[in-house]
Structure formats: C-alpha cells, structure tokens
C-alpha cells in the first residue's frame, strides 16, 4: 500500500511544503508586480552594487510581502540579511538571489 512504505509520509510532507512554497512564490510575484511596474509613482527594484540602510515604515503591502519572504526563507536562513540594509532577499524561480527593498540610485 502506498501509504505503508517507509518514508512516504516524509515524501508527502516534502511535496506539500514544496507546493506551499510554490504558492507563496506566486503570491510574492503578484505582490511585486502590484507594487511596481503598474504604478508610475513606484519604481521597480533595481539591483545595485551599493546598499544603504535607511529607516522606513513597515506597513500594508510591505508587511504582507515581508511575511511571504519570511515563510519562503524559513527555516534555513536568518530573518534579516545582516548588514545589508534590506528587509529581505527575493528568490526568483531559478533560485538566484537579488536585492529587494534596498535600492538606491546607481551612481555613474
């Protein structure tokens, strides 16, 4: 019986977790789009070589996105990216990592 084999519960748990991660990943993408490209008053995040730490209010959509990011990273990574001045890292669908929430002007 498929449920009787050793490790199958673990497999189910893993696939369930993966499904949840995929769902959250999609949610994060939606939030990204909602916050950026559709709004002239909002810039899309741009990865830059210099990060600046600034105090900004955490509310609304940012709070929601922070929760999604935390769930995506847990339990293997720390809650904050230490010393980066960013409130999180964005993991895209091919698993590369880019800065989120820490853009400043790129100087020439």
């Amino acid at each position: 019986h498929p449920l009787g084999s050793p490790g199958s519960a673990s497999d189910l748990e893993t696939s369930g977790l993966q499904e949840q991660r995929n769902h959250l990943q999609g949610k994060l993408s939606e939030l990204q789009v909602e916050q950026t490209s559709l709004e002239p008053l909002q810039d899309s995040p741009r990865p830059t070589g210099v990060w600046k730490s600034r105090e900004v209010a955490t509310e609304g959509i940012r709070g929601h996105r922070k929760m999604v990011l935390y769930t995506l990273r847990a339990p293997r990574s720390p809650k904050m990216v230490q010393g980066s001045g960013c409130f999180g890292r964005k993991m895209d669908r091919i698993s590369s990592s880019s800065g989120l929430g820490c853009k400043v002007l790129r100087r020439h």
Epitope: S37, L41, V56, A57, G101, V104
Partner: antibody, heavy 124, light 111 residues
C-alpha cells in the same frame, strides 16, 4: 553627485506646445523615476506627471489630455510636452527624482533632488 | 483648487513649536501613510522633509516630525529658527486618480 536641469524655451505662444527636457547626471533614469512639478507665480506646487524607472508614465488627471512625458535612456534625459498652452500655463517648471529605498510605497512622490527650475511664460 | 487643505499662514516666535495640518479625504490622506512634506523658500526649489508620513528625509533635523491620523496629516516643527521661515506643502497619494496631489501650501512666518 546627482544633478538635474530643465532646458527649453522661456517664452511660448498661446496654443503652441511647451517642450522641456530634463538633463540628468549622477544617476540613470532606468534606476529611478523622474517627476515634473510646476508652480505658477504666487501659487501652490502642482504635479504634472512622472515617468518611473520602467518607463511607465503617469499624469495629473487635469492635464492628461495635453501632457506627454517620455525618456531617452541613451541620453539619460526625460522630456515633457504640454500642448495647447494658455497664459494659465505660465509657471516655473521643475524636474526631480528621489533617492529613497525602493520599498517606499509611491516613492516617486517624494522628490529630494530637484533641478533649479525653468520659468516659462506663455504670451503672444 | 488643491484637493488637500492647509492653513494659508501661521506665525510663531523663535524657539516655539508649530503644527501645520493637511486635511484630505479617505481617498488620499486617509488612504494610508503615503504623505510627504516639502519646505520651499520663495525663489528656490522645494526640499523634501518627510516621506511616508513619519520618516525624515536625509539631513533633515529632528526638530521636524510628521504624523497622520485619519484624513489629516500634521507637520510639527519644534524649537523654531529664523531659517524655518518658508512655505510648506503636503503631498499625498490619491487612490481615485492613482496619482499624487499637493496641498494648498502654508506660509510660516517666524516673528
């Protein structure tokens, strides 16, 4: 260092098109949005429009039909075009950008780098 | 006519405090902490003081602070100095137009 300057004619005839260019140095217009604001003599500040770092433009609803904002990324410039001008369009025209974290919601409203402004008079 | 209402003028003596209000509606000021404040000395470009309702822009003294409650945003300046004499404008996101709106402006005179 971020520098911005509004360039264009200081005198425009009624019914003509007012065209200004915002020249930018110290940052790329693909990294930060550029906004336009004007101020008629003795009056309050007024939003004209904004083009974000993706090239998406937004306009003051009251001016939307007459206004166009475009950018030239190769020249790192943003241009404003206001058609069918009247004497009511006489004002100092400013362009500006912001240097704030990208997660600041509606951050392009918060301009903290400004050009010196260009006084444009509409008169025949 | 500006959508956001500010007192046209206020005056105070040096060392005193002043609060400048910016009244709007549920579609702008009341929509969230998407409010900013600019200072403008006549003849010069505006200067950003406050963004996101309460955050001070870089280099702005802590004598300047912002708050928002309901449909009203407030800029408070403590320990007034002569150089604070200027025009002050609020700005807010407006959800109905999906664009920004400025307040009518307040002339602050330091006596």
């Amino acid at each position: 260092q971020v520098r911005m300057q509004e360039l264009g004619p200081s005198l425009v005839k009624p019914s003509q098109t007012l065209s200004l260019t915002c020249t930018v140095s110290g940052f790329s217009v693909t990294n930060s949005g550029v906004g336009w604001v004007r101020q008629a003599p003795g009056k309050a500040l007024e939003w004209l429009g904004i083009i974000n770092n993706d090239g998406v433009a937004g306009y003051n609803p009251a001016l939307k039909t007459r206004l166009s904002i475009t950018r030239d990324t190769s020249k790192n410039q943003v241009s404003l075009s206001l058609s069918s001008v009247t004497t009511e369009d006489t004002a100092v025209y400013y362009c500006g950008t912001r240097d704030l974290p990208s997660d600041v919601r509606y951050g392009n409203m918060y301009i903290n780098y400004w050009g010196p402004g260009r006084m444009v008079t509409v008169s025949s | 006519q500006a959508v956001l209402t500010q007192p046209s003028s206020v005056s105070r003596s040096p060392g005193q405090s002043v609060s400048i209000t910016c009244s709007g509606s549920s579609s702008n000021v009341g929509y969230g902490n998407y409010v900013g404040w600019f200072q403008q000395v006549p003849g010069s470009a505006p200067k950003l003081l406050i963004y996101s309702a309460t955050s001070r822009a870089s280099g702005v003294p802590d004598r300047f602070s912002g708050s928002r409650a309901g449909n009203t945003a407030t800029l408070t300046i403590t320990s007034l100095q002569a150089e604070d004499e200027a025009d002050y404008y609020c700005v807010s996101y407006d959800s109905s137009s999906k664009f920004g709106v400025f307040g009518s402006g307040t002339r602050l005179t330091v006596l």
